[in-house]
Amino acid sequence: SGTTNTVAAYNLTWKSTNFKTILEWEPKPVNQVYTVQISTKSGDWKSKCFYTTDTECDLTDEIVKDVKQTYLARVFSYPAGNVESTGSAGEPLYENSPEFTPYLETNLGQPTIQSFEQVGTKVNVTVEDERTLVRRNNTFLSLRDVFGKDLIYTLYYWKSSSSGKKTAKTNTNEFLIDVDKGENYCFSVQAVIPSRTVNRKSTDSPVECMGQEKGEFRE
């Protein structure tokens, strides 16, 4: 259906990490342009990325208004020189996206180990609380602010001389672990939302090892 010189968008895909959310689609336009609309299940449609030749649209500003809502987007196709033109049914061609619930589906970004400090046989490892684009009272919320106790971190730690990785977990951003005195350890963290069934884990943080800059040692 639709006009002979436009094709409907397809492969509409949500790409979202720490709530930065972009809708992508195909095909690359030939003599056509796109406009995107987004809505919650019960809300009104809002237009974004008007008459664009891009095949992506940043919808972050819309979804961060309520990350627990479920959103639907649609991509309209128009002839490049005649955006008023409509399909055979009297309206432009469009394709719907899959539904998207940011709180349940946004990918967890790669965490960063902010610091570690050794005091005797204890090491305190701190994970950076990454800022998101979700706002409350004009301030950007951190990942922990948004997810609360739903978000946990797994720490993998190992002696530099060994391969076996011990684990520790926290629902804050800090770990306090026991280590052997005189041994150097390496650390990596992973963000996890255990209540999820998909997109449960982030990729691992870069590995940080004792004896490098981020660490501090006190007897």
Epitope: Y156, G164, K166, A168, I177, T197, K201, D204
Partner: antibody
């Protein structure tokens, strides 16, 4: 439905090798941690080791270190326990279990177990 | 490694009895303790996690509590299907460790 199915057990001579498989369905193993636990006849539960299939990280119990190796193939949604240099004391039912990776990390689903007998 | 000392190793009880099993951790494990039930020839089943939270589908006669490094599993009114072996487990640190088990038998 979440399911774990172990296979590969059997009778093996001391010093021999065996590879156990743990096939998962109803969930993706890369989102969880998979543990191996064993139980000698009439005895309690003994933890053998774990793998995080998302990064390949493992840890093995001292009793099996250097002899057993845990691995995973995420494309097959399966974890493995490679057992070498087997001893009579390795005779047990071997279970794989899923760790939900919450703060308390209970093993929320277990396989039915596969029996490994090491005997000449 | 953290030791989990479970007691008693076995007990005899009747249907309707209140049954208590305890586990003592050799060091602080916070609330990272789970309890499992195992019947002969079967895999263990999760009953309690985070020391006191009832796992989905587990009858409310099962409960768990913590006092420092002491953990308790209570069955408020023993049912015929509850005759089994029970294990505690800590997963506060690697390696996770199990208690020796408590066999609950019919008196």
């Amino acid at each position: 439905e979440v399911q774990l199915v172990e296979s590969g057990g059997g009778l093996v001579q001391p010093g021999g090798s065996l590879r156990l498989s743990c096939a998962a369905s109803g969930f993706t193993i890369s989102g969880y941690i998979i543990h191996w636990v064993r139980q000698a006849p009439g005895k309690g539960l003994e933890w053998v080791g774990y793998i995080d299939p998302s990064n390949g990280y493992t840890y093995h119990a001292d009793s099996v270190k250097g002899r057993f190796t845990i691995s995973a193939d995420t494309s097959k949604n399966t974890a493995y326990l490679q057992m070498n240099s087997l001893r009579a004391e390795d005779t047990a039912v071997y279970y794989c279990a899923r760790d939900d990776q919450s703060v308390s990390s209970p093993f929320d689903y277990w396989g039915q177990g596969t029996l490994v007998t090491v005997s000449s | 490694d953290i030791q989990m000392t479970q007691s008693p190793s076995s007990l005899s009880a009747s249907v309707g009895d209140r049954v208590t099993i305890t586990c003592r951790a050799s060091q602080d494990v916070n609330t990272a303790v789970a309890w499992y039930q195992q019947k002969p020839g079967k895999a263990p089943k999760l009953l309690i996690y985070s020391a006191s939270f009832l796992y989905s589908g587990v009858p409310s006669r099962f409960s768990g509590s913590r006092s420092g490094t002491d953990f308790t599993l209570t069955i408020s009114s023993l049912q015929p299907e509850d005759f089994a072996t029970y294990y505690c487990q800590q997963h506060y640190t690697t390696p996770p460790t199990f208690g020796q088990g408590t066999k609950v038998e019919i008196k």
